[in-house]
Amino acid sequence: FERTRSLQDPCSNCPAGTFCDNNRNQICSPCPPNSFSSAGGQRTCDICRQCKGVFRTRKECSSTSNAECDCTPGFHCLGAGCSMCEQDCKQGQELTKKGCKDCCFGTFNDQKRGICRPWTNCSLDGKSVLVNGTKERDVVCGPSPADLSPGASSVTPPAPAREPGHSPQ
């Protein structure tokens, strides 16, 4: 039944970039400026997204596809389809409600976005710290202390409920 109805529906013949105009006896009319229809058989065209303010146009709107936005320098996209722009921080910082703040000791951020996260806890894998962590870089784990003495075998201890020192990643 659905298939029969769609064959009789003149609107189903209207391609993307047009809409089925009820005011003009259901003929296919092109989408007006600043609007689009991405699929056929539409009875209206959607308004194009406008990239204003902190948003900038990544892809112009066409009659068949919406505009795409990204963020101006110093900001980055958040959310599906870049629905929000969030301020960048420097490496070694994270964005808080009070602005960009340095990572607290024991955490790092190697990007201009996101949050500071704890240094890897090398001891969880029975390894030792080869290179200390910084605000911008994670620690580098090396061989376990036992591996450095010939003939010694290393056993990885189970993770304790409370782990002082470095946090794992």
């Epitope: 994270e94 964005l95 808080t96 409600k97 607290c104 000791f105 024991g106 955490t107 996101g114 949050i115 500071c116 996260r117 704890p118 240094w119 409920a161 409370r162 782990e163 002082p164 020192g165 470095h166 946090s167 794992p168």
Partner: nanobody, 116 residues
């Protein structure tokens, strides 16, 4: 000390979803950030998702767009909504609470198995 109790793990088919929960109790003063780590057999424990006190988040690349971490500051609890699960997500998931470099705490872990 801080106690962390995880729940919500289990066996799920590929493409399925689970919601992992973690509640903190005990001597809680200033929890700076909370997160979820996972450890698969024979692999290193890795950070999956973390949320700080401002609500900022971090996700490891392999779960971006599939997992969502949320935090209830009043209850001192976090959830991890895991969607479109894959066999490679199979691991023990540990809740982690970071107060400072010297003070951070672990839950006992909850098993997540993704298999058909």
């Amino acid at each position: 000390a801080v106690q962390l109790v995880e729940s919500g793990g289990g066996l799920v088919q590929p493409g399925g979803s689970l919601r992992l929960s973690c509640a903190a109790s005990g001597s809680i003063f200033s929890i700076n950030r909370m997160g979820w780590y996972r450890q698969a057999p024979g692999k290193q424990r890795e950070l999956v998702a973390m949320i700080n006190s401002s609500g900022g988040t971090y996700y490891v690349d392999s779960v971006k767009g599939r997992f969502t971490i949320s935090r209830d500051n009043a209850k001192i609890a976090i959830d991890l909504q895991t969607n479109s699960l894959k066999p490679e997500d199979t691991a023990v998931y540990y809740c982690h609470c970071w107060v400072s470099h010297e003070m951070n705490y672990w839950g006992k872990g909850t098993q997540v198995t993704v298999s058909s």
